[in-house]
């Protein structure tokens, strides 16, 4: 019961986490800036992985997509890749974990198969969560680096004078959503891995023995039936009668109409 609860909870937590990772990836508020020192209008700029938006004090908002791939910073491309990999792995993990849930019966799937699937999905959730956390952290680091690099330096170019204005950047809501979502996916994955241990069936401490009648006239030795149970004193699976008690390893490969398993 505890295993089912752990597995179910792990699945739900991971599901919420992956939904959060998808939401964070789609959000525009990865970085936000207030550009109030302007004589025309107060401007609020916010940027995501896919587009940059400007909102004015009048309420007007304009968003422009990053249509070029070549002009974008390598770090931004890396963050996009990490988030997408996280989503893909998480989605596959969710698909696998649905079939692995103990409360869902699919045909005659054994517990060992469910345990393996639970472990697989758990690992996928862990990697997915780590990808999201890494992606968000790389973006946050990029913001901090940009802030210190853009401290009011001026230079003159072909088009006149360019002044880099120092801004009070802030981490956008998407960063916090991403961090929390990545953490939840990671926790969900760990829970699935823990549940996997409880799902794995206990190993049997005896070897299964199969019996084959080699012919029509079989001479049983005394005590043969007692030994045939697979228990008792005959622990090494030695042949007690000529009828041919064999261990699984010794079974003949050719079929016979008198074979009993």
């Amino acid at each position: 019961m505890a295993v089912t609860a752990c597995q179910g909870l792990g699945f739900v937590v991971s599901l919420i986490g992956i939904a959060g990772i998808i939401a964070a990836t789609c959000m525009d508020q990865w970085s936000t800036q207030d550009l109030y020192n302007n004589p025309v209008t107060a401007v609020f700029n916010y940027q995501g992985l896919w587009r940059s938006c400007v909102r004015e004090s009048s309420g007007f908002t304009e968003c422009r997509g990053y249509f070029t791939l070549l002009g974008l910073p390598a770090m931004l491309q890396a963050v996009r890749a990490l988030m997408i990999v996280g989503i893909v792995l998480g989605a596959i993990g969710l698909l696998v974990s649905i079939f692995a849930l103990k409360c869902i019966r699919i045909g005659s799937m054994e517990d060992s198969a469910k345990a393996n699937m639970t472990l697989t999905s758990g690992i996928m959730f862990i990697v997915s969560g780590l990808c999201a956390i890494a992606g968000v952290s790389v973006f946050a680091n990029m913001l901090v680096t940009n802030f210190w690099m853009s401290t009011a330096n001026m230079y003159t170019g072909m088009g006149g004078m360019v002044q880099t204005v120092q801004t009070r950047y802030t981490f956008g809501a998407a960063l916090f959503v991403g961090w929390v979502a990545g953490g939840l996916t990671l926790i969900g994955g760990v829970m699935m891995c823990i549940a996997c241990r409880g799902l794995a069936p206990e190993e049997t401490n005896y070897k299964a023995v199969s019996y084959h009648a080699s012919g029509h006239s079989v001479a049983y030795k005394p005590g043969g039936f007692k030994a045939s149970t697979g228990f008792g004193s005959n622990t090494k699976n030695k042949k007690i009668y000529d009828g041919g008690a064999r261990t699984e390893d010794e079974v003949q490969s050719y079929p016979s109409k008198h074979d009993y398993v």
């Epitope: 990865w30 970085s31 800036q33 550009l35 302007n38 025309v40 209008t41 401007v43 700029n45 940027q47 940059s52 938006c53 400007v54 004015e56 004090s57 009048s58 007007f60 908002t61 304009e62 422009r64 990053y66 070029t68 002009g71 910073p73 770090m75 931004l76 973006f139 990029m142 913001l143 940009n146 802030f147 690099m149 853009s150 088009g159 006149g160 004078m161 360019v162 002044q163 880099t164 204005v165 801004t167 950047y169």
Partner: nanobody, 120 residues
Framework: QVQLQESGGGLVQPGGSLRLSCAAS????????MGWYRQAPGKQRELVAG???????NYGDSVKGRFTISRDNAKNTVYLQMNSLKPEDTAVYYC??????????????WGQGTLVTVSE
């Protein structure tokens, strides 16, 4: 890099008209605000007019009612229509744009200036 290309300046008689234009080019995300400033000889640089992406405008007191600012967002270009020009409008007119240049950074870019001379 962001470049500004200004054009339209020249010599005009009092009461005449001129149209200045300024086009921004280069790699950037957005241009929230585009505008014009001017600097007459021996005077400080002052705001002539500014316009936001949404069309919010702001004019300097000395040009209200005579000058009109407009912009083409698709072409990243700002225009300044100057009517009823006076000799005191003689100055170097500078294009100024606020550019969102990258993730977590923005630039204030100034053009090289175009000379407007109003005289008989």
């Amino acid at each position: 890099q962001v470049q500004l290309q200004e054009s339209g300046g020249g010599l005009v008689q009092p009461g005449g008209s001129l149209r200045l234009s300024c086009a921004a080019s280069g790699t950037f995300f957005n241009i929230p605000v585009m505008g014009w400033y001017r600097q007459a000889p021996g005077k400080q640089r002052e705001l002539v007019a500014g316009i936001s992406t949404g069309g919010t405008t702001n004019y300097g007191d000395s040009v209200k009612g005579r000058f009109t600012i407009s912009r083409d967002n698709a072409k990243n270009t700002v225009y300044l229509q100057m009517n009823s020009l006076k000799p005191e409008d003689t100055a170097v007119y500078y294009c100024n744009v606020l550019v969102i240049s990258g993730i977590g950074s923005h630039l204030e870019v100034w053009g090289q200036g175009t000379l407007v001379t109003v005289s008989e």
